[in-house]
Interface confidence: low
Amino acid sequence: EAHKSEIAHRYNDLGEQHFKGLVLIAFSQYLQKCSYDEHAKLVQEVTDFAKTCVADESAANCDKSLHTLFGDKLCAIPNLRENYGELADCCTKQEPERNECFLQHKDDNPSLPPFERPEAEAMCTSFKENPTTFMGHYLHEVARRHPYFYAPELLYYAEQYNEILTQCCAEADKESCLTPKLDGVKEKALVSSVRQRMKCSSMQKFGERAFKAWAVARLSQTFPNADFAEITKLATDLTKVNKECCHGDLLECADDRAELAKYMCENQATISSKLQTCCDKPLLKKAHCLSEVEHDTMPADLPAIAADFVEDQEVCKNYAEAKDVFLGTFLYEYSRRHPDYSVSLLLRLAKKYEATLEKCCAEANPPACYGTVLAEFQPLVEEPKNLVKTNCDLYEKLGEYGFQNAILVRYTQKAPQVSTPTLVEAARNLGRVGTKCCTLPEDQRLPCVEDYLSAILNRVCLLHEKTPVSEHVTKCCSGSLVERRPCFSALTVDETYVPKEFKAETFTFHSDICTLPEKEKQIKKQTALAELVKHKPKATAEQLKTVMDDFAQFLDTCCKAADKDTCFSTEGPNLVTRCKDALA
């Protein structure tokens, strides 16, 4: 129903705490360079205004849209042009163009320093002094670095953060309590960020229909006992929620997500037998839990898929009468039978099925033409299965760091023009798939591996879009979302690349590397590895291993030396010479 005041409606629905958190996230995602204090001031002003509208919905400006209210606030910020350049031009536009303009200026790779975690004692002190401000800083810092982070889910992670601090700050050894728990939250939040970015990319590039297809496949896998009408309803609602969040309508998004969670919990009998434990939780935990609930037990009596989609004499008639519905039922029926497939694979199969019907239903004898369609799925299924087997075998042999290095070499050879920091970030993220997925039971590996890789490669595409340098990457990123991963996997050494000349300073290191945390040391070594491959794209694995082992030995020796500086300055040039010789 229509409300006289949209802002009063959302404030009432969400409550003050969530309302303020979501407005802070929205502002931080739009204006990524502003300080916490600047944004906190705006949030307070918006909240005070919302309260006046709650008291009197007819008060001045209470009838304005949220985009108008928020946009006016952002455009009133002093020094907007100096700090944000052409983003300030958005303020010359009217809604809805102004909001679209803000969205287009969101930066997926803002030049902000990494979010460093303070040491335990300092963190606990500031948390105890003012928990609200502390959590506000967390929301602000994450949101500005991840401008498409799923806002209601970020509130969930903030709640987790809060609970961990409350528990650990009361302990004697705060550090050892906090570190593993906060690392766990950080890892989950980063994965959540790339997954959500993928959903927004799908929505932005291919529209709601593409996202809805993704949702139908995913929901059908999770809720195989729900009927098609139920799955369609859930997919439609989920599409609306994601469209709102991707579009910056965070209050509506969070409100609608809460409604969807409520609906699911009120309709468990027709959706899934696995929802009860989620539904017993408070709102943020409930919605999070529902989003990753385990798959329901598959119905025992499902007939073979061929009956309705290959053997039925009416296939072409049914397809012609309502293409989207017929393809939707195919995707639903196939997905509920295959929780062991990735959503990307299921969408490729549905696309293949659609292409087959398009071709065959125009022929003289359609059944003879489409009769082999299920057999034609085989190579599409085998390809990702082989990918999982090969990569998980390699991960088990090399461990995470070694596996990342293998991927780094592979991807630097595929796209040597891409900047080294981007290649290192991508390889480190892609390499984590081993730890994340290869330890899972066999039937969960494929969906985990492929859908995670697709999300990481989406980030590669987004970063590459800003400064396109590789034709290989452009080719893979231009196609459909579900074809990206197979496209990247199929890339080989870029023969058009002219190798980089050898620069000694690229491989020159100093004693400061010795005191870096392990992760930073790894990144330094991986940076050197990518540069080596750019210098010698056709170097063999054996040659690269020799050089990297020598490099590791050099670091180990010099970091243990009494006079580290002298060791680095004398042994460093020798290492560079040996590297050149090994790769000659």
Epitope: N225, A226, D227, Q268, I271, A300
Partner: nanobody, 115 residues
Framework: QVQLQESGGGLVQPGGSLRLSCAAS????????MSWVRQAPGKGPEWVSA????????RYAESVKGRFTISRDNAKSTLYLQMNSLKPEDTAVYYC????????GSQGTQVTVSS
């Protein structure tokens, strides 16, 4: 082999009652949500009611709410549908199904409401 066998249908006057049963075998009955679906002559299948695996959560189509009650006995692997205040428009073949599915894997039981 999954088998669902409905019984309890028959001819009843408007306002009367019937209790349908569905005996299940060939699968772990207690692990699955179950539904009743009906099909009137010349019409498509219509979902009537569903119950979750434990029997705690039940759902009904608007047309039968307040008149029909779904229940189950997991020890006996049997699903029930108690139908009160029956109306002529309840006339149909009633099927039990696994999950909330309208695909029918059984013969069904005929319910006719007529004076």
């Amino acid at each position: 082999q999954v088998q669902l066998q409905e019984s309890g249908g028959g001819l009843v006057q408007p306002g009367g009652s019937l209790r349908l049963s569905c005996a299940a075998s060939g699968f772990t009955f207690g692990s699955f949500g179950m539904s009743w679906v009906r099909q009137a002559p010349g019409k498509g299948p219509e979902w009537v009611s569903a119950i979750d695996s434990g029997g705690a959560d039940t759902r009904y189509a608007e047309s039968v709410k307040g008149r029909f009650t779904i229940s189950r006995d997991n020890a006996k692997s049997t699903l029930y549908l108690q139908m009160n205040s029956l109306k002529p428009e309840d006339t149909a073949v009633y099927y039990c199904t696994i999950g909330r599915s309208s695909s029918r894997g059984s013969q069904g039981t005929q319910v006719t409401v007529s004076s």
